[in-house]
């Protein structure tokens, strides 16, 4: 009995034409939604003039359907038992699941001003930038629609820069008609314990963003894991959104539509400072903002974003050190709403439900030569938005799963 089931599972989770795993892997059968909450700044003038705390009010959800496109350029390599692919990006706005429209306006940090002043720290260049910022009537904050903020807009300040720079700015620009990858993952044919584990990403086994082990591409992409998952396991996965590999640990048993699943969560330890978790030393890339690597809960991914000062955190700075959230008013972190979890069916290793939550922040620093940043007395890691990407196995698929997998075992 058990051996037969094991044999069947091993056969069905291989990533090759004809298996259950392959069919769902190429194009997810689950509807995946990405909800956005935008942090609307309530006191832009006070911040700019007096370096006050930034008062934010989250507005959302604004929901998009994502991950509905099939993987592209799927190529098997029989020699090393891998399959390579591109994961195309696409987002469709869902008005019925949103509090407003894509034309809703928000007061947010001026992305171009914050980024340019960080990238170009030479004071003369900042004086040039200042004259262009003034000429374009740009400021520290700006009013943008949801569509502009997420998917891109032509920035008036950058449009005046007299040498070639990308003048379109957006938190996820470019997105539609782009793809993530190339990923090359093990198909599990020769060794089922390696199935879905990433061999290379963009042709490399390392990211080139971090030092030492932090730079490694570990585990799968979190959509599935090798079968026969144990509660004691630490599940490693790579997320291109945060430019790093991370891990999840078992939290609890959950019943999902009659299917017993293991809930794995990202622990606070993964976001800890090197003081508390020495393994994280290589995620601390500079000493000033991180207060000599004692701050925690924010990840500087600027190296992965062409030098733009992007910091990733959990929503509302969950698991972050007090110094990070101190200059921001209006945040209310709570685990239930703001942590990331994966519900994994342990026999197959398939992720049947997940909630991936993260927050995009931008660093803005005082600048002596940029008028609109001149009055700042401190650095701010400014929350721009947080997102909740969720997927749950459909009822039909759950029935099929129960009858074909868990039902047979029980």
């Amino acid at each position: 009995g058990d051996l037969l089931i094991q044999k069947t599972i091993k056969k069905q989770v291989v990533l090759e034409e004809g298996t259950i795993a392959f069919k769902n892997w190429v194009k997810t059968g689950t509807e995946v939604y990405r909800q956005f909450w935008i942090f609307d700044v309530q006191n832009p003038q006070e911040v700019m003039m007096n370096s006050s705390n930034i008062q934010v009010k989250q507005r959302g959800p604004y929901t998009y359907r994502v991950r509905f496109l099939a993987k592209e350029n799927v190529t098997q390599d029989a020699e090393d038992n891998t399959v390579s692919f591109l994961q195309p990006n696409g987002a469709i706005f869902e008005p019925s699941l949103s509090v407003g429209t894509e034309a809703d306006n928000f007061t947010v940090l001026n992305l171009a001003v914050a980024a340019a002043s960080h990238i170009y720290q030479n004071q003369f260049v900042q004086m040039i930038l200042n004259s262009l910022i003034n000429k374009s009537k740009s400021s520290m904050f700006q009013v943008r629609t949801l569509r502009e903020l997420l998917w891109g807009y032509r920035d008036p300040f950058l449009s005046l820069v007299p040498y070639p720079v990308t003048t379109t700015v957006g938190l996820f620009y470019p997105y539609n008609n782009t793809a993530d990858g190339v990923y090359k993952v093990f198909n599990g044919k020769d060794n089922i314990s390696k199935v879905a584990i990433i061999d290379t990403y963009k042709g490399k086994r390392n990211l080139s963003y971090w030092e030492s082990h932090c730079d490694m591409i570990n585990g799968t992409d979190a959509a599935s894991f090798p079968p026969f998952v144990e509660k004691s396991q630490v599940l490693q996965f790579f997320s291109s959104d945060i430019c790093r590999s991370i891990y999840a640990v078992f939290e609890s048993d959950v019943n999902l539509k009659g299917i017993p699943v293991y809930r794995f969560v990202l622990p606070s330890k993964a976001f800890a400072s090197p003081v508390e978790n020495p393994d994280n030393y290589c995620f601390c890339t500079e000493k000033i903002i991180s207060k000599n690597c004692t701050s925690y809960g924010v990840l500087d991914i600027s190296k992965c974003k062409e030098g733009r000062p992007v910091y990733i955190s959990l929503p509302h700075f969950l698991y972050a050190s007090p110094d990070v959230s101190e200059p921001i008013d209006g945040l209310n972190p709570n685990e239930e709403e703001h942590r990331t979890y994966l519900d994994i069916e342990p026999i197959t290793g398939f992720t049947l439900q997940f909630a991936k939550r993260l927050q995009v922040n931008l660093l803005v620093k005082p600048s002596e030569k940029i008028q609109v940043l001149k009055n700042l007395k401190r650095n701010y890691i400014v929350p721009i938005l947080w997102l909740n990407e969720t997927g749950t196995i459909g009822d039909e698929k759950a029935n099929m799963f129960r009858s074909q997998v868990t039902g047979k075992i029980n």
Epitope: Y120, N122, Q123, F124, V125, N130, P162, Y163, E368
Partner: antibody, heavy 120, light 107 residues
Amino acid sequence: QVQMKESGAELVRPGASVKLSCKALGYTFTDYEIQWVKQTPVHGLEWIGGIHPGSSGIVYNQKFKGKATLTADKSSSTAYMELSSLTSEDSAVYYCTRGGGYDGAWFAYWGQGSLVTVSA
Amino acid sequence: ETTVTQSPASLSMAIGEKVTIRCITSTDIDDDMNWYQQKPGEPPKLLISEGNTLRPGVPSRFSSSGYGTDFVFTIENMLSEDVADYYCLQSDNLPFTFGSGTKLEIK
């Protein structure tokens, strides 16, 4: 140590052009901008413009737009200023100087100056 | 454009006396004023940079003060080697603008 080595004196005819050079030594050329300054007995010191080789940022004093053209060659750590359509008003000593960089020490290092004389 | 008005144009002082030169700007420039000394046949030399910062190697008899639009450069006890032209430069905004200079001579 930091040095700015300028080209020598030039005697040029009215209407002609002249290209002055400034070789930067003792620091990373792309980190700091090079500024050009004109000095005459009548107008004293006047800022012409500056170029930041690292970012390709160039800015001119409106007064010298069309008169001066600034360029930089990263491979030789040399900055150039071309002055065109010369008149007697352009007779002056021209200095290249290293800019403030990151600490607000504006024009801390100067070249020895290039004397340009415009005469028929 | 920020204009810089420097005074006096020339100054004749005895050795050991206190020398004061003033620069007034047409716009508020915080403390972004710099002071230079130029001796005949030489390029200008930076003495004091933004924030009234005395440059390394510059004798402490030189100092400056001021914020906003009014700036003063002082030589506490004038020495014969201080005979030179002195210029101020505002570095708050572009274009950089110099004062017209002060010629310091020995009385």
